[in-house]
């Protein structure tokens, strides 16, 4: 029997290699049954996850899944870091795994490196 718990489908240790100046949508896939939970995004600062207030977010509905989207318009170098989404469901908080944005500033890279290069060459990235 299908679980009716809220589930957040962000993979552990997932990452996105992106470029400053580009638009980017960070998606939090949410599975729920009857009532859509309240979902928020936060950004990790050490062990604390700081809630992102006043940011452009939206919902996208697909067949079996809803997506709570955090919009970056555009991506800034300071957006580099790890993010987590959380759902408030029946007064319990369900947290996703964190996902990391690796932001490359195109001004400091003569040409755009590949995703794998970026993940394996941390000196290209902001910390």
């Amino acid at each position: 029997k299908e679980s009716c718990d809220v589930q957040l489908y962000i993979k552990r240790q997932s990452y996105h290699s992106i470029f400053a100046g580009d638009p980017f949508k960070l998606e939090c896939p949410v599975k729920y049954c009857a009532h859509r939970p309240q979902v928020t995004w936060c950004k990790l600062n050490g062990t604390t996850c700081v809630k992102l207030e006043g940011r452009h977010t939206s919902w996208k509905q697909e067949k079996n899944l809803s997506f709570f989207i955090l919009h970056f318009e555009p991506v800034l170098p300071s957006d580099n870091g790890s993010y987590r989404c959380s759902a408030n469901f029946l007064s319990a908080i369900i947290e996703s795994h964190s996902t990391t944005l690796y932001v490359t500033d195109v001004k400091s890279a003569s040409e755009r490196p590949s995703k794998d290069e970026m993940a394996s060459r941390p000196w290209l990235l902001y910390s």
């Epitope: 957040l8 993979k11 995703k115 993940a119």
Partner: antibody
Framework: QVQLVQSGAEVKKPGSSVKVSCKTS????????IHWVRQAPGQGLEWIGR????????KYAQKFQGRATITADESTSTAYMELSSLRSEDTAVYYC????????????WGQGTLVTVSS | DVVMTQSPLSLPVTLGQPASISCRSS???????????LNWLQQRPGQSPRRLIY???KRDSGVPDRFSGSGSGTDFTLKISRVEAEDVGVYYC?????????FGQGTKLEIK
């Protein structure tokens, strides 16, 4: 039913490349990480790297960086591991393993592919 | 890299008796999400590995309840309450908290 079916045994010359495939079924490959692990004759297990079929992102052990290429074709639910510049020490059984990425709910292994590097 | 050290490397056991395998990591396997990503694998002779235990103590479906995992931080144990003939093989601990993921050397369980 869940299956990870790997390609057959290969005999390769030193300096050449080999590409091993891993056809998955019974689950959505996008929900998993595909790992490649090898086992030299009579030895233990050695992690080569990991691919996220949902977006192509890949991580490698330093030892294999630049020599191994791990990919996945979501449309055919098949993962691949290519190893170049082969040497005799690369003789091993190569395994693919599929681990669910969200809640660790499953971890399945392929049957293994023996790659023999010999002149 | 995280070094995983198993002991003993060879474990002769009488059928029906308990068995215990230790695995120590060179650094803590506690991830920042509060979970510890330590797996135990079984490799029977001539077969591919099979996941028995994940997240230190969770048993995979189909794994007999005579297998149990415990531990935290850097110290982990796999216990078999009563060894059966089908348990013969090599057991590996595997951490997937830190890149690169690493395995223990393996413990060969055989029947006395």
């Amino acid at each position: 039913q869940v299956q990870l079916v790997q390609s057959g045994a290969e005999v390769k010359k030193p300096g050449s490349s080999v590409k091993v495939s891993c056809k998955t079924s019974g689950f959505n490959i996008k929900d998993t990480y595909i790992h490649w692990v090898r086992q030299a004759p009579g030895q233990g297990l050695e992690w080569i790297g990991r691919n996220d079929p949902a977006n192509g992102n890949t991580k490698y052990a330093q030892k294999f960086q630049g020599r191994a290429t791990i990919t996945a074709d979501e449309s055919t639910s098949t993962a691949y591991m290519e190893l170049s510049s082969l040497r005799s020490e690369d003789t091993a059984v190569y395994y693919c393993a599929s681990y669910e990425g969200y809640y660790e709910r499953f971890g399945y292994w392929g049957q293994g592919t023996l790659v023999t590097v010999s002149s | 890299d995280v070094v995983m050290t198993q002991s003993p490397l060879s474990l002769p056991v009488t059928l029906g008796q308990p068995a215990s395998i230790s695995c120590r990591s060179s650094q803590s396997l506690l991830d920042r999400d509060g979970k510890t990503y330590l797996n135990w694998l079984q490799q029977r002779p001539g077969q591919s590995p099979r996941r028995l235990i994940y997240l230190v103590s969770k048993r995979d479906s189909g794994v007999p309840d005579r297998f149990s995992g415990s531990g935290s931080g850097t110290d982990f144990t796999l216990k078999i309450s009563r060894v059966e003939a089908e348990d013969v093989g090599v057991y590996y601990c595997w951490q997937d908290t830190h890149f690169p993921y690493t395995f223990g050397q393996g413990t060969k369980l055989e029947i006395k």
